[in-house]
């Protein structure tokens, strides 16, 4: 599941990783666009073991995975893949 959140918080991620995470371990992916106090886009991966990983948006694997998820959802769902949550 891909989610986009617009929040008024500062940056959530202190450290980012580019290490590949297999899809079988991923519960959901949260995307925080830049702005509202954080100068950069942030991607937070919520894993099935309840741990949370901040992923470098430039990491090749996350870009590919999001592209696959976007394509899959746009071909199977009539609704947009992004959920916008405004506080």
């Amino acid at each position: 599941v891909l989610e986009v959140y617009y929040t008024s918080l500062r940056c959530r991620c202190v450290q980012e990783s580019s290490v590949f995470i297999p899809r079988r371990f991923i519960d959901r992916i949260q995307i925080l666009p830049r702005g509202n106090g954080c100068p950069r886009k942030e991607i937070i991966v919520w894993k099935k073991n309840k741990s949370i990983v901040c992923v470098d948006p430039q990491a090749e694997w996350i870009q590919r995975m999001m592209e696959v998820l976007r394509k899959r959802s746009s071909s199977t769902l009539p609704v947009p893949v992004f959920k916008r949550k405004i506080p």
């Epitope: 290490v19 590949f20 995470i21 297999p22 079988r24 371990f25 073991n49 741990s51 090749e60």
Partner: antibody, heavy 120, light 107 residues
Amino acid sequence: EVQLQQSGPELVKPGASVKISCKASGNTLTDYYMNWVKQSHGKSLEWIGDINPNNGDIIYNQKFKGKATLTVAKSSSTAYMELRSLTSEDSAVYYCAIYYDPYYHAMDYWGQGTSVTVSS
Amino acid sequence: DIVMTQSHKFMSTSVRDRVSITCKASQDVSTGVAWYQQKPGQSPKLLIYSASYRYTGVPDRFTGSGSGTDFTFTISSVQAEDLAVYYCQQQYSVPLTFGAGTKLELK
């Protein structure tokens, strides 16, 4: 440091079953997956499946479904693999190997291997 | 299943040479590839994960690169203790699969 201690070599007859064990000791975190890997003599590595001791989730390689059964005794940090209806094709060294979910997602600790020989 | 193809079963090298071992995945695995070293009579050892990340304690002469379907494992200056079989493995999806291995031997 994590150590994986496997049970000793097995010589079994065709058609029989065998159960091999793998005991984890040392700094074993909770979020690891126990993998089992087959290596036939002079050949490459084949992934049999893995089990998450935390929740008992098991994923098998389709090729080994019906051949291998993975179990775990969480209290003793010991994983088991039972192989049944053995044939000469099952003669191999079997490794247990773990990877920690938090980071690598690669098999960073391996047991010493258990040799299984199927012969009448 | 994803097939991992290591094109060379054997590679001859000399001490202090630079050597590269290649691995090709049958489909896109992004950067989900690990490399292992196995010496005779020993268990495999993890050297590289996520295509290019060196595992803890692995000397920096070992490097990995690649993404998608093409991956390379390089030893910048081969030492005698590096003579072993090297396997690639895809971490991308189950079943996890390994290459057939490349045996590094002295010329």
